[in-house]
């Protein structure tokens, strides 16, 4: 008789999840010599230990501590780029501007990027059928708690000027419920971070509005200012040109507003 299995609202664990995590770890540590000391089998064991045999709605940050310890990594604290709802452009930017880092450029972020995972209470099985959805099922699921944990640590490590890329095409350019709005903003350390600089990325070709005046951006400014961190904002009217100018800063067309 097949055992009854909890049906969740979200997609199940990504196909070949254990193999993918292990492969990404091997690749990352091979390419980034400063992480060469990491034992990928131990990393996978710690990752697995965070959610296997546990109820997928009852995961805590504590569950991920062994993994966090193994994945400890120093990135230049003044070169951090946060993002919200605009991951692809943020990653394209750090591919070109190698001196800056998103969370997904670190080992732990790289391991989990675009993956889904969960287990089942009291069995060592990975659930490939369904996993809890943050809204419809529960927020303390393995994926959400992982990103909350690594995002908090990433924000805590930041110093000097921190940049954040925001999606100007969305109704809420700054969303208090996003990982950036609910975790990272509140974990920037005022004693280390001088300024948060927001880059609002425009979607439409003809969109010349000053989205830095958007009410949600003003809300972000208020939250940041109350935390004794300065705030600045820039419109990126042409994201394609912006990337080109990062690649070729000496191009004559790059002196005008992007």
């Amino acid at each position: 008789v097949p055992r009854w299995r909890q049906q969740w609202s979200g997609p199940g664990t990504t196909k070949r999840f254990p193999e993918t995590v292990l492969a990404r770890c091997v690749k990352y540590t091979e390419i980034h010599p400063e992480m060469r000391h990491v034992d990928c089998q131990s990393v996978w064991d710690a990752f697995k230990g965070a959610f296997i045999s546990k109820h997928p709605c009852n995961i805590t940050e504590e569950d991920y501590q062994p993994l966090m310890k193994l994945g400890t990594q120093t990135v230049p604290c003044n070169k951090i780029l946060l993002w919200s709802r605009i991951k692809d452009l943020a990653h394209q930017f750090t591919q070109v501007q190698r001196d800056m880092f998103t969370l997904e450029d670190t080992l732990l972020g790289y391991l989990a990027d675009d993956l889904t995972w969960c287990g089942e209470f009291n069995t060592s099985k990975i659930n490939y059928q369904s996993c809890p959805d943050w809204r419809k099922d529960c927020s303390n699921n393995p994926v959400s708690v992982f990103w909350k944990t690594v995002s908090r640590r990433f924000a805590e490590a930041a110093c000097d000027v921190v940049h954040v890329m925001l999606n100007g095409s969305r109704s809420k350019i700054f969303d208090k419920n996003s990982t950036f709005g609910s975790v990272e903003v509140h974990n920037l350390q005022p004693e280390k971070v001088q300024t948060l600089e927001a880059w609002v990325i425009h979607g439409g070709r003809e969109d010349s509005r000053d989205l830095c005046q958007d009410p949600t951006i003003k809300e972000l400014e208020s939250i940041i200012s109350k935390r004794n961190i300065q705030f600045s904002c820039k419109n990126i009217y042409r994201p394609d040109k912006f990337l080109q100018c990062v690649k070729n800063p000496e191009d004559s067309s790059c002196t005008s507003e992007i």
Epitope: E19, T20, A23, R24, K27, Y28, I31, H32, P33, T94, Q95, R98, D99, D105, Y110
Partner: antibody, heavy 119, light 106 residues
Framework: EVQLQQSGTVLARPGASVKMSCKAS????????MHWVKQRPGQDLEWIGG????????RYNQKFKDKAKLTAVTSTSTAYMELSSLTNEDSAVYYC????????????WGQGTLVTVSA | DIQMTQSPASLSASVGETVTITCRAS??????LAWYQQKQGKSPQLLVY???TLPDGVPSRFSGSGSGTQYSLKINSLQPEDFGTYYC????????FGGGTKLEIK
Amino acid sequence: EVQLQQSGTVLARPGASVKMSCKASGYTFTRYWMHWVKQRPGQDLEWIGGFYPGNSDTRYNQKFKDKAKLTAVTSTSTAYMELSSLTNEDSAVYYCTRGDRHDEGFAYWGQGTLVTVSA
Amino acid sequence: DIQMTQSPASLSASVGETVTITCRASGNIHNYLAWYQQKQGKSPQLLVYNAKTLPDGVPSRFSGSGSGTQYSLKINSLQPEDFGTYYCQNIWTNYTFGGGTKLEIK
């Protein structure tokens, strides 16, 4: 703008050694792997090896382990490849090429250095 | 070492057609596969990495797919500038290239 400028055409005798250069600009030289690729006329691409200027880490294709030596001078952002005990089989275009952030593809290439081995 | 077998070795097609090039690895390369285009006398150009990701600036008519040991590159609505030689590359270990596919105008 990322640029990889390679040294010019080389004509060498069998048994000799040659050292070619690849001058990088437009990025932090010590933060990326520099790879070298061989292409014989009308033939396929072969990976020779890679060098990480940040800590002089080196990886070789076993086939080229005794043939090629990869080095770099970080102060001038220049990578070098020396080929020894040249034979006709070493006549080829040699490319230096830089990986992307996580080395998931060779995103930038030099223009190639043609090496001709002839008595 | 992992060997990469590319097929077909050559292919002729007309502008506007769709073509697919395949690449088989002798072992699992975990999606660490890149595709390049090379024109006569020029350096190769990166078209796809991580099996399916297009670098900034590569036209969307190019698409990569596959996993494990089987991968493919699809070019929709061929343009005159798409003709040349295409190579797959295993980025997982030892960076071995496939034998190339020469795409010619019919």
